[in-house]
């Protein structure tokens, strides 16, 4: 009686269980019932990543540096090639098929966390006490400088874009 | 110990000004903030700005801007707000309180004066 | 400028009862360079100044009783009565001090069931 389900890494064919080709191979006949099935490695920029019954094998992905992309992990012929992203730049989606130039936080924020490949700056507000007098992708908020353990006074209060401005202590009005 | 008093009350006529002190003892004034807040009557809590005594920087409430003018004396250890122009709903509690001593973490008021209240009646 | 709500606006309770105050803030108080949420809470009762109660969310002030407790994070702060007292009879303000304005919460009475 022919089969109606077959084993893993089998599919069933012509009423009869033939094996699936491995990864990095694909399909070139099915097996009969003398013959196994025959498979044939996939070729240079090819892939297929499952046992299968595919006759093409898959291209790998192509890392468009005019998209800011690079190579992060070349591919095999049982793995696609994963791109990332320049320097600088990171991922407009979890497939990364392009990028944007990382955010900078503007002059009264810092960097919370800077960017990664797959992830962009996140920013946070300077709060009082701290500040950032630049547009960046890196730095944080810098405390404000202590003129008391300089022996200084506060001449002009600090901002959240702006650092205290110290002077002698005679200055004091 | 810290103490903040406040000059008494006032009644004033709208359009007028009115200037209410705040005496600081127990403390190195110049160093430390003097914070400004409001409540008008049954009404919360306003923040209307603040001084640094020691370099006369300021800060204020956008709100309060033309409104609250504050100043301060070294000399004396007395800070100063000034508010012009009084209108019926100027009528509040005015508070002074300490704020940050100059550490850059103490930005929360941890003494206050008593409270000057300014009636602005016709 | 940062709003901050607190909810609820009045509560009945007796003595001896957990009060249970909420804050939140429209966006997060928290700095991620010191790990500190900067928030206070006051109590103020009739005709009298406000009285700091809590700083940095949840450091109690000195000389406050330990029945006052502060806790949360980022955007969501509850202040803690463990069990009320006669004298804890008031309105109580949250205020936020991260970026100029400083803002309080339009308070909480707390009243005599």
């Known amino acids: 009686e022919p089969p109606t389900a077959c084993r893993e890494k089998q599919y069933l064919i012509n009423s009869q269980c033939c094996s699936l080709c491995q990864p990095g191979q694909k399909l070139v006949s099915d097996c009969t019932e003398f013959t196994e099935t025959e498979c044939l490695p996939c070729g240079e920029s090819e892939f297929l990543d499952t046992w299968n019954r595919e006759t093409h094998c898959h291209q790998h992905k192509y890392c468009d540096p005019n998209l800011g992309l690079r190579v992060q992990q070349k591919g095999t012929s049982e793995t696609d090639t994963i791109c990332t992203c320049e320097e600088g730049w990171h991922c407009t989606s979890e497939a990364c098929e392009s990028c944007v130039l990382h955010r900078s936080c503007s002059p009264g924020f810092g960097v919370k966390q800077i960017a990664t490949g797959v992830s962009d700056t996140i920013c946070e507000p300077c709060p009082v006490g701290f500040f950032s007098n630049v547009s960046s992708a890196f730095e944080k908020c810098h405390p404000w400088t202590s003129c008391e353990t300089k022996d200084l006074v506060v001449q002009q209060a600090g901002t959240n874009k702006t650092d205290v401005v110290c002077g002698p202590q005679d200055r004091l009005r | 110990q810290v103490q903040l008093v406040q000059s008494g009350a006032e009644v004033k006529k709208p359009g007028s000004s009115v200037k209410v002190s705040c005496k600081a003892t127990?403390?190195?004034?110049?160093?430390?903030?003097i914070e400004w807040i409001r409540q008008a009557p049954g009404q919360g809590l306003e923040w209307i700005g603040s001084i640094l005594p020691g370099s006369g920087s300021t800060n204020y409430n956008e709100k309060f801007k033309g409104k609250a003018t504050f100043t301060a004396d070294t000399s004396t250890s007395t800070a100063y707000m000034e508010l012009s122009s009084l209108r019926s709903e100027d009528t509040a509690v005015y508070y002074c309180?300490?704020?940050?001593?100059?550490?850059?973490?103490?930005?929360?008021?941890?003494?206050w004066g008593q409270g000057t209240l300014v009636t602005v009646s016709s | 400028d940062i709003q901050m709500t607190q909810s609820p606006s009045s509560v009945s309770a007796s003595v001896g009862d957990r009060v249970t105050i909420t804050c939140r803030s429209s966006q997060s108080l928290l700095f991620s360079v010191n790990q500190k949420n900067y928030l206070a809470w006051y109590q103020q009762k009739p005709g009298k100044a406000p009285k700091l109660l809590i700083y940095?969310?949840?450091s109690l002030q000195s000389g406050v009783p330990s029945r006052f407790s502060g806790s949360g994070s980022g955007t969501d702060f509850t202040l803690t009565i463990s069990s009320l007292q006669p004298e804890d009879f008031a309105t109580y303000y949250c205020?936020?001090?991260?970026?100029?304005?400083?803002?309080f919460g339009q308070g909480t009475k707390v009243e005599i069931k």
């Open positions: 127990g403390y190195t004034f110049s160093t430390s903030w």
């Open positions: 309180a300490r704020g940050d001593d100059g550490s850059y973490v103490r930005w929360y008021f941890d003494h």
């Open positions: 940095w969310a949840s």
């Open positions: 205020q936020h001090y991260y970026s100029y304005p400083w803002t």
